[in-house]
Amino acid sequence: MRTEAQVPALQPPEPGLEGAMGHRTLVLPWVLLTLCVTAGTPEVWVQVRMEATELSSFTIRCGFLGSGSISLVTVSWGGPNGAGGTTLAVLHPERGIRQWAPARQARWETQSSISLILEGSGASSPCANTTFCCKFASFPEGSWEACGSLPPSSDPGLSAPPTPAPILRADLAGILGVSGVLLFGCVYLLHLLRRHKHRPAPRLQPSRTSPQAPRARAWAPSQASQAALHVPYATINTSCRPATLDTAHPHGGPSWWASLPTHAAHRPQGPAAWASTPIPARGSFVSVENGLYAQAGERPPHTGPGLTLFPDPRGPRAMEGPLGVR
């Protein structure tokens, strides 16, 4: 896991003899600077491994290195979801898991990481140069997607360590909007600071923050966020054509994903169709996902992937026993 940089607490200098306007002019840069310094970029890592025991079996592990609550994870292959990629599994923290052949087993490993075992022979079998992508929708960051594939010369049973994958996409509506505001803020801040440098400095009481504090961590996007800037979207063509969902066998029956058409993965719809919409606060989350969750209740009974989940017509809380466990 990535170690986190500890950001020093930045405090605006005391107003001293400055007037109200001067005070406001001074506070704004500090607020913007704090935003610039602390604006961490979420990352997604993907690890793909071929099992030594079964050469047609792959294990995909993905993790999210953001601070928000994960609201949906979509795993696809053959390229990013919605760009020719085929959905293999959808994992929701309260609605459970949905998977399609050749996905054998999708599971949450921790609150921020998932794993998926793929197996197959014939048409639906993955092959060594297949690209696998994981998309994490989170609040408030939006959606982040990373892709990875087996290293070309990897031996069965071996894999590259899980690192942030080279292909990372932030959904424009959610992330780039925020990034744009921050970028504008940072540019404006630099402009203000430069302008401030050429003015006689007002007499200020000494700041409680050391002079080095603002420089403690220059705001630079991480490798993954640079990938997001330089490769806003990438489609990978693989010589291995994954099976379409038309031939895939759902793991369970009708449930919260009941409205998903079987051909959804070939078009930007289905499990990830709503993800380019800015993610609202959790309270209104379901309304964004209506295409995916149809008329399902707020949560189905706790069943494993092999069991059928039926939406309860009586409404969101109708299916619950104590704390939702029946």
Epitope: W108, T110, Q111, T303, G306
Partner: antibody
């Protein structure tokens, strides 16, 4: 209904071993991880470890490594915890719980009380 | 392993009071913290996951907050049925570790 049914209370002598069982109904244990948690009287909880019933791979807290052994039998949808070389410190309630279908322990067994007495 | 230090160990409150329980991790666990409630003679039940996401069906008087190393669980208006043991769990890194627990008693 999704449930984890645990075996009955055990009364054992110091130095002995005990095997606890946890049988799942309403879901297949192959689709989740099974974790074991220890709770001593009037104390907090200790994570013993987890097992992946699909392949038998397990992971333990170093505190329990060597004395605890987790196994599963997918044909009977049952997970087992074996504790050896028991001491009075092992007197506790042992819970099995599932993780993986959701990113938290959503279903717990009722617990098995193990009492080590001289 | 990561140590989760939970305070206080005991809370004696009256119905209607507001209570806060804290868990401090010995290193960052990001938001991978869960809060459970365990009533006497029962198995634990999930209240909060992702440090601040309230589980479906959990009354909104229960809230969680925090990120990194400092986490707080709050009951805004304690009710008689909230008498229980509350504990946090981190699943950020293995071995997973629990807080020592807070026993809430009603006057």
């Amino acid at each position: 209904e999704v449930q984890l049914q645990q075996s009955g209370a055990e009364l054992v002598k110091p130095g002995a071993s005990v095997r606890l069982s946890c049988t799942a109904s309403g879901f297949s244990i192959r689709d989740t991880y099974i974790h074991w948690v220890k709770q001593r009287p009037e104390q907090g909880l200790d994570w013993i470890g987890k097992i992946d019933p699909a392949n038998g791979k397990s992971e333990y807290d170093p505190k329990f490594q060597g004395r605890a052994t987790m196994t599963t039998d997918t044909s009977s949808n049952t997970a087992y915890l074996q504790l050896s070389s028991l001491t009075s410190e092992d007197t506790a309630v042992y819970y099995c719980t599932r993780y993986g279908y959701y990113p938290y322990f959503d279903v717990w067994g009722a617990g098995t009380t193990v009492t080590v007495f001289s | 392993s990561i140590v989760m230090t939970q305070t206080p160990k005991f809370l004696l409150v009256s119905a209607g009071d507001r209570v806060a329980i804290t868990c401090k991790a010995s290193q960052s666990v990001r938001h991978d913290v869960v809060w459970y409630q365990q009533k006497p003679g029962q198995s634990p039940k999930l209240l909060i996951y992702y440090a601040s996401s309230r589980y479906t069906g959990v009354p909104d008087r229960f809230t969680g907050s925090g990120y990194g190393t400092d986490f707080t669980f709050t009951i805004s208006t304690v009710q008689a049925e909230d008498l229980a043991l509350y504990f946090c769990l981190q699943d950020f890194s293995s071995p997973w570790t629990f807080g020592g627990g807070t026993k809430l008693e009603i006057k």
